[in-house]
Interface confidence: low
């Protein structure tokens, strides 16, 4: 029986107790005088629970207070009694849901050393499921006296939650350890205990797939089951409006959070949680026709597509050759630059330069087709927009966390002592960015321009099939010797009146004279995923012309000619370490098979715990 | 065999990122250059690794990461006899050979010689006083002599610096993969990228079997002032959160 309201929590002992509890309680009632006065409580799974027991009602001086589950010797496993402060505290898990009866009794030490019962009181604590708090406390519950409640979100508004993933097993922790963990997190979360939630990871779901911002911790592996410690940041926030999370981001990454909490930190993420809707009575649904809006063609006119951040490590980045708005320049910071939002423009093979700082960016800019460069990770240089080969003047790791108006900083201050300054709340425009530091997907949304009632590729009413059109030229792809690259063909490259966007067309990659790219070529194309990928070696340095053919369902096609520029290694021989591994087998089998070579690079990256294969540059494959 | 050489683009060129390289090195290899199970598992079955070396270059050219020269314990009281250090450039097979086979053979030889000397001395003392029965008893009660060629050096004893993982034992699971985890980053996300961020857990069919590296990754012996050549390594206690 679940009470519909917390106020219904069981008070009428004799009528509502489980049968098994009757005798226990009647024994208690008969044995000692019962003092009524401790109100029944409610707790929520994953939330801290705390109640102060008014011991003066029960015990007089010299009495020994004993708190336990009614009829038992010990407390329920999720509760802890602090005899100093006379508080009962704990943090229930999912397995603790239900009603718990707590007995508080006072005993006095008799002359013969035995404990003589004085008074006793029994009260209940009902543990509600997790989502109860979202419905009750966050939205409507009245605060306890003296409690500051964070402003509730509107009924249909998502709650923005920051979650820290810990390598810890809550089931192995004592109730005190769980509460202590929340206490220790307060310095990072800056919210009170009752506003934090601590739950175990369920079904290995460490990461929230709806997260819009995330960062790593100091732990590289998860040994324990995992615990999720979260708190509310606000209502329906996005990456442009999240409050400053510097207090979480750097300590999580650098180990300070782990040191304070006493558990390794795996990572953190921010996501919007839809409020759990109140359960409704199901009613008959009448089927009604739904109008379908077809996707309109991408425009090549100047416009502002919706900003999206998509930091796929091995997908290209967009950086317009036009003026953009970006956050103000901050002090140089170690590591990878910030992911920024870009409108469709030049697509840069992004050097990823260290930890990406979360950033809020507002931008406006013209959508001008530009050049494509697949994403990769090369810290040793910064690539200006129009330059084909990396400049060799900057040997120091550029420490930029936001796009800079000028050349990257070559400040050689130690990476371990520099920290990013607090992020400014509002971004302001900066001059045209020459330093490419964004990682986003090659993608722009196409606004619907007309409504169609059919979405199939068959022309309507005998209209002739129209040939697909090239809308946004691929232009050029940049690749580096020994480094894997991949380019997702943007969905607005071609447009077909019947089949709509590029992803609905059949793409094929060809050389001159309609010759298909060979199975052994260093460039490969997956027509299903519309992904072009490859791994050039030193013999491929230079320019290579390729043709992307887009064919609609009616067999008509359009072509885009583009170049792949293969550059020498930007790091040259300056890389700070050379890794060498000896494997069993014949090198010729790997050297002559592009798929094996790519597999090797992917596996090497995996071995380093990295899914971004472009972090590895093959230098040599020889016979041992 | 195939020798593959590569560099890691996440490492800054300057100043020498020694801590990062050490971390990456010990993620894939034992101190003696033996591939860690996590590395082997990630590359198998297509690529079976036998040894790994990591050498500093560029701004780290003065450093040798794998195989390592373990620090030499120089206690304040009595310094141990110095063993000439090995050449860090030597291949890791030589390294394993130096660490396991040669010491075993040397120990066996010393035992053998000591045994022979002891027997000679004993026999000289009691020359002609042993009955056949006594002799038989002596042989029965004696310490067995292991000859050098009887030593099974085909497989060296497991290094105690590696955690002993039983075959049935399931390895712990890795964390969510944040892109480029070797260089931490904070990333705004989008639905399209979620594939890149999904945790590499058991349900992931492409997840390479994860073998956890030992919790501590530097050489385990003597850190007095400078390095020393001392084996065997002792394994450290596991990392236990407080």
């Amino acid at each position: 029986h679940w009470p519909s309201e917390p106020s219904e929590a069981v008070r009428d002992w004799e009528n509502q107790l489980e049968a098994s509890m009757h005798s226990v309680l009647s024994d208690l009632h008969e044995a000692v005088p019962t003092v009524v006065g401790i109100p029944d409580g409610t707790a929520v799974v994953g939330r801290s629970f705390r109640v102060t027991i008014p011991t003066d009602l029960i015990a007089s001086s010299g009495d020994i207070i004993k708190v336990s589950a009614a009829g038992k010797e010990a407390l329920p496993s999720w509760l802890h009694w602090d005899s100093q402060s006379h508080t009962l505290e704990g943090l229930p898990l999912d397995t603790d849901k239900g009603v718990h009866y707590i007995s508080v009794s006072a005993t006095r030490l008799g002359a013969n050393g035995s404990h003589i019962p004085q008074t006793s009181s029994v009260f209940s604590i009902e543990v509600y499921p997790e989502d109860h708090s979202e419905l009750q406390s966050v939205r409507t519950a009245s605060p306890d006296p003296g409690e500051v409640v964070s402003s509730a979100c509107a009924a249909d508004e998502p709650v923005t939650v920051l979650t820290v993933i810990l390598d810890a097993d809550l089931t192995k922790m004592t109730p005190k350890q769980r509460i202590d963990l929340l206490h220790r997190m307060r310095s990072f979360s800056e919210v009170e205990l009752h506003n934090m939630k601590l739950v175990p990871v369920v079904n290995n779901r460490l990461f929230d797939m709806s997260a819009f911002m995330a960062g790593p911790g100091n732990a590289k592996k998860v040994v324990e089951n995992g615990a999720l410690l979260s708190w509310k940041l606000g209502c329906s926030l996005n990456q442009n409006s999240v409050p400053d999370i510097h207090g979480v981001e750097a300590p999580a990454r650098e180990g300070a959070m782990s040191a304070q909490l006493g558990y390794p930190v795996v990572g953190w993420h921010i996501a919007n949680k839809k409020p759990p809707l109140p359960k409704r009575v199901r009613r008959q649904i009448h089927a009604t026709p739904t109008p379908v809006t077809a996707i309109g063609p991408p425009t090549t006119a100047i416009q502002e597509p919706p900003s999206r951040i998509v930091p796929t490590p091995t997908s290209p980045a967009i950086a317009p050759p036009t003026e953009t708005m970006a956050p103000p320049v901050r002090d140089p910071v170690p590591g990878k630059p910030t992911v920024t939002i870009r409108t469709r423009g030049a697509i840069i093979q992004t050097p990823t330069l260290g930890p990406i700082q979360p950033t809020r960016v507002s931008e406006a800019g013209t959508t001008v087709p530009g050049q494509i460069r697949p994403t990769m990770t090369i810290p040793g240089y910064v690539e200006p927009t129009a330059v084909a080969t990396p400049p060799t003047t900057t040997t120091k790791k550029p420490r930029v966390s936001t796009p800079k108006p000028a050349t990257p900083s070559t400040d050689s201050t130690t990476t371990t002592t520099r920290r990013p300054t607090k992020k400014p709340r509002t971004p302001r425009p900066v001059p045209r960015v020459t330093t490419k530091v964004s990682i986003t997907r090659l993608e722009t949304a196409s606004p619907p321009t007309r409504i169609r009632t059919t979405t199939s590729g068959v022309p309507r009413g005998g209209e002739p099939n129209q040939r697909p059109e090239l809308k946004n030229h691929i232009d050029r792809v940049d690749a580096w010797v020994g480094t894997y690259f991949e380019v997702k063909i943007p969905s607005d490259t071609f447009y077909d009146h019947e089949d709509t966007t590029t992803d609905k067309l059949k793409l094929t990659l060809k050389l001159r004279e309609q010759q298909l790219v060979g199975e052994k070529s260093w460039v490969q194309f997956n027509s299903n995923s519309q992904l072009m990928y490859g791994l050039p070696d030193s013999s491929h340095v230079g320019k290579h012309e390729y043709f992307m053919h887009a064919t609609d369902k009616g067999g008509l096609s359009a072509v885009d000619a583009f170049e792949i520029h293969v550059h020498r290694r930007p790091q040259g021989d300056r890389a700070p370490a050379r890794f060498k591994a000896k494997f069993v087998g014949d090198p010729a089998l790997v050297l002559n098979d592009i798929h094996k070579k790519i597999a090797l690079v992917k596996k090497l990256a995996f071995a380093f715990g990295d899914r971004n294969c472009s972090t590895i540059t093959l230098q040599n494959i020889t016979r041992g | 065999s195939i020798v593959v050489e590569w560099t890691n683009n996440t490492l800054p060129l300057e100043p020498c990122p020694k801590e990062q390289i050490a971390g990456l090195s010990r993620r894939i290899a034992e101190d003696d250059g033996k591939p860690r199970p996590a590395f082997s598992n990630a590359l198998e079955p297509d690529f079976k690794a036998t040894s790994i070396t990591v050498t500093g270059s560029g701004s780290c050219r003065h450093l040798q990461f794998i195989p390592v020269v373990p620090p030499r314990r120089v206690p304040s009281e009595a310094p141990p006899t110095e063993v000439p250090d090995r050449d860090p450039e030597k291949s890791s097979e030589d390294d394993v050979y130096l660490h396991t086979v040669i010491p075993a053979v040397v120990v066996a030889a010393i035992l053998l010689i000591a045994g022979i000397i002891a027997m000679i001395c004993y026999r000289k003392k009691r020359k002609g006083k042993l009955t056949l029965e006594d002799q038989a008893t002596f042989i029965k009660k004696g310490v067995p002599i292991i000859f050098a060629d009887e030593l099974d050096d085909s497989k060296p004893p497991p290094s105690s610096s590696m955690p002993l993982i039983l075959q049935e034992e399931k390895a712990p699971l890795p964390p969510p993969e944040y892109p480029n985890q070797s260089v931490p980053e904070t990333t705004p996300l989008n639905q399209d990228t979620m594939g890149e961020y999904t945790p590499l857990r058991d349900e992931d069919p492409n997840a390479p079997p994860y073998q956890p590296p030992p919790p501590f990754t530097a050489p385990m012996e003597g850190k007095g002032s400078r390095p020393k050549n001392m084996t065997p390594y002792r394994s450290p206690p596991p990392y236990v959160p407080p």
């Epitope: 650098e254 371990t416 | 500093g56 450093l63 040798q64 020269v69 620090p71 250090d85 850190k223």
Partner: antibody, heavy 123, light 111 residues
């Protein structure tokens, strides 16, 4: 960001035991290769190394003071402690704790230092 | 114990000029091809700061005007060109043998 901070009694009498604490952040003594040591410097004089503890609880002491020194650590709390028994006025100095990490080919220097805590021994 | 002798005890150099500090060890501090010698800078009221490790390697964030050289028993620290902020005491320290020992220091003053 690596930081170390020493704390101590400030003033104590001869023959008492000096207890010093080094609280650090930005690294952990559960990470292999990490160590923390103590160095002291009497006012206007040079530096004297006292003791060192490594991540695996290996301890090293200056032989000239060994009988008086005890170094220990609390890995979970990121703290290292030094006890000096039966101090006298000659132990008046600024006491520093410093991190010492080792990488092969480096010389295991003390790469990060605390600001120091001043200790006066006087009757 | 290895005794480190620093000379001179103090040094006065004009801005922009070269400052050279010497450190001699009572026995070799080399081991396996590496020199276990470090140099630190200390300003009044501040802790020492690592400048050079393994005789010649500049620590992260240290300006390139600092350089170290030497092996065996003789080591040198050079600053060129000297800047105002370089006024401090410079210590050499060996880590080749326990106990770790420091030189007595050389004080750099600006003329």
């Amino acid at each position: 960001q690596v930081t170390l901070k020493e704390s101590g009694p400030g003033i104590l009498k001869p023959s008492q035991t000096l207890s010093l604490t080094c609280s650090f952040s930005g690294f952990s003594l559960s990470t292999s290769g990490m160590g923390v040591g103590w160095i002291r410097q009497p006012s206007g004089k040079g530096l004297e190394w006292l003791a060192h503890i490594w991540w695996d609880d290996d301890k090293y002491y200056n032989p000239s003071l060994k009988s008086q020194l005890t170094i220990s650590k609390d890995t979970s709390r990121n703290q290292v402690f030094l006890k000096i028994t039966s101090v006298d006025t000659a132990d008046t100095a600024t006491y520093y704790c410093a991190r010492r990490a080792y990488y092969y080919g480096s010389s295991y220097p003390m790469d990060y230092w605390g600001q120091g805590t001043s200790v006066t021994v006087s009757s | 114990d290895i005794v480190l002798t620093q000379s001179p005890t103090s040094l006065a150099v004009s801005l922009g000029q070269r400052a050279t500090f010497s450190c001699k060890a009572s026995q070799s501090v080399d081991y396996d091809g590496d020199s276990y010698m470090n140099w630190y800078q200390q300003k009044p009221g501040q802790p020492p700061k690592l400048l050079i490790y393994a005789a010649s390697n500049l620590d992260s964030g240290i300006p390139a005007r600092f350089s170290g050289s030497g092996s065996g028993t003789d080591f040198t620290l050079n600053i060129h060109p000297v800047e105002e902020e370089d006024a401090a005491t410079y210590y050499c320290q060996q880590s080749n043998e326990d106990p770790l020992t420091f030189g007595a220091g050389t004080k750099l003053e600006l003329k």
